[in-house]
C-alpha cells in the first residue's frame, strides 16, 4: 500500500533572468527512493539516481543545476519556462509518487514571494 505523500513548492513565480529552486519532499513512507525524475510537460529535465548521481538532459545542461538535495535549480529563466513541472519519485517497494509545481516567469521586476522553497 502506498502511504507516502509528496509536498511541493506548489505555484511559484520568479523574475525573467533569475533563478528558482524546484523542490519536492516525500514523507509518510519508509520506502527507499531509487530515482527522482524531473520533467517539464513532455521533456525530461534531469534524473537523480540514488546509486549513480545526476543526469541533466542535454538541452537543459546550461540552465539547470542539480540540487539542493533532490531538488532542481533553474537558471536564466525566460517566459517560455512558464508551465508545469513534475517530480517523479521512483521508490521501492511502494512504486511511483508524482508531485506537480506550476512556475510563472514574470517580465515584471515584482515577482511574488512566499513559496516555501523559493530562492529569496
Amino acid at each position: 500500500m502506498m502511504t507516502g505523500t509528496i509536498e511541493t513548492t506548489g505555484n511559484i513565480s520568479a523574475e525573467k533572468g533569475g533563478s528558482i529552486i524546484l523542490q519536492c519532499h516525500l514523507s509518510s513512507t519508509t520506502a527507499q527512493v531509487t530515482q527522482v525524475n524531473w520533467e517539464q510537460q513532455d521533456q525530461l529535465l534531469a534524473i537523480c539516481n540514488a546509486d549513480l548521481g545526476w543526469h541533466i538532459s542535454p538541452s537543459f545542461k546550461d540552465r539547470v543545476a542539480p540540487g539542493p538535495g533532490l531538488g532542481l535549480t533553474l537558471q536564466s529563466l525566460t517566459v517560455n519556462d512558464t508551465g508545469e513541472y513534475f517530480c517523479i519519485y521512483h521508490t521501492y517497494p511502494d512504486g511511483t509518487y508524482t508531485g506537480r509545481i506550476f512556475l510563472e516567469v514574470l517580465e515584471s521586476s515584482v515577482a511574488e514571494h512566499g513559496a516555501r522553497f523559493q530562492i529569496p
Epitope: 530515482q35 525524475n37 520533467e39 513532455d42 521533456q43 525530461l44 534524473i47 543526469h55 542535454p58
Partner: antibody, heavy 119, light 107 residues
Framework: DVQLQESGPGLVKPSQSLSLTCTVT?????????WNWIRQFPGNKLEWMGY???????SYNPSLKSRISITRDTSKNQFFLQLNSVTTEDTATYYC????????????WGQGTAVTVSS | DIVMTQSHKFMSTSVGDRVSITCKAS??????VAWYQQKPGQSPKLLIY???YRYTGVPDRFTGSGSGTDFTFTISSVQAEDLAVYYC?????????FGGGTKLEIK
C-alpha cells in the same frame, strides 16, 4: 579506449551456478558509472540483469533478484556475474556494458559470451 | 515493468531510402529513451540517447524523436552498412527494459 571483455564457461549444467567475469581496460570501474550485465536470448530479446556502480552499490532486475549477484575486484578492474539455480531458460549470450550517467545509456559493450545450459 | 513494443520485427528497404522504426512504451517515459544498433555477429552499439540526441561519432543520417509513449528512429538515407537490428530502451525508471528489436533488411 574503453574495452570490456567477458569470460567464463560456455556450458553450465541445470541447477548449477553460472559465473562470468568482465575485465575492463581503459577506465577504472571505481571512477564513475554503472557496470552492467545484459543478456540476449535466442531470438534476440535483450534483458538488463543488473549493475554494480562505481561505489559498489548494486541494482538487480527484480525477476532475477533471488538468483543474481554482481560483485567486483577493484584491484583487477573486473566485475562478476553469478546466477544461481540455472535452467535451460538461462541459455543466452551474456554481455557486460558500461552505463554512462551523462548519456544515461550503455555506451560501451563487451563482445558477448555465449552460455548454454544443458545436461 | 515498462514494456517497449517495436511492432515491426522486420523492415525491408533499399539503399538511399528513408526508413522509420517505431517504438511504443506501455506507460509514460518522457524522453528517457535510447536506440541501439546491433550488426550481425556484433554487440549492440549506442546511437541515440535521451530520445533525440546522437551519440559521439554517430552519422547525422540517424535521428531520434518522440516523447511520452511514442518514439521514432529514422535513417534519412539508408546505406548498405545499416543492415542491423535496432533496439529501443527506456531508462525512465530503475528497471531498464528493451524493445524486441526491428531487423532492417536491405533489398
Amino acid at each position: 579506449d574503453v574495452q570490456l571483455q567477458e569470460s567464463g564457461p560456455g556450458l553450465v549444467k541445470p541447477s548449477q551456478s553460472l559465473s562470468l567475469t568482465c575485465t575492463v581496460t581503459g577506465y577504472s570501474i571505481t571512477s564513475d558509472y554503472a557496470w552492467n550485465w545484459i543478456r540476449q536470448f535466442p531470438g534476440n530479446k535483450l534483458e538488463w540483469m543488473g549493475y554494480i556502480s562505481y561505489s559498489g552499490s548494486t541494482s538487480y532486475n527484480p525477476s532475477l533478484k533471488s538468483r543474481i549477484s554482481i560483485t567486483r575486484d577493484t584491484s583487477k578492474n573486473q566485475f562478476f556475474l553469478q546466477l544461481n539455480s540455472v535452467t535451460t531458460e538461462d541459455t543466452a549470450t551474456y554481455y557486460c556494458a558500461r552505463f554512462m550517467i551523462t548519456t544515461f545509456a550503455m555506451d560501451y559493450w563487451g563482445q558477448g559470451t555465449a552460455v548454454t545450459v544443458s545436461s | 515493468d515498462i514494456v517497449m513494443t517495436q511492432s515491426h520485427k522486420f523492415m525491408s528497404t533499399s539503399v538511399g531510402d528513408r526508413v522509420s522504426i517505431t517504438c511504443k512504451a506501455s506507460q509514460h517515459v518522457s524522453t528517457a529513451v535510447a536506440w541501439y544498433q546491433q550488426k550481425p555477429g556484433q554487440s549492440p552499439k549506442l546511437l541515440i540517447y535521451s530520445a533525440p540526441y546522437r551519440y559521439t561519432g554517430v552519422p547525422d543520417r540517424f535521428t531520434g524523436s518522440g516523447s511520452g509513449t511514442d518514439f521514432t528512429f529514422t535513417i534519412s538515407s539508408v546505406q548498405a552498412e545499416d543492415l542491423a537490428v535496432y533496439y529501443c530502451q527506456q531508462h525512465y525508471n530503475t528497471l531498464w527494459t528493451f524493445g524486441g528489436g526491428t531487423k532492417l533488411e536491405i533489398k
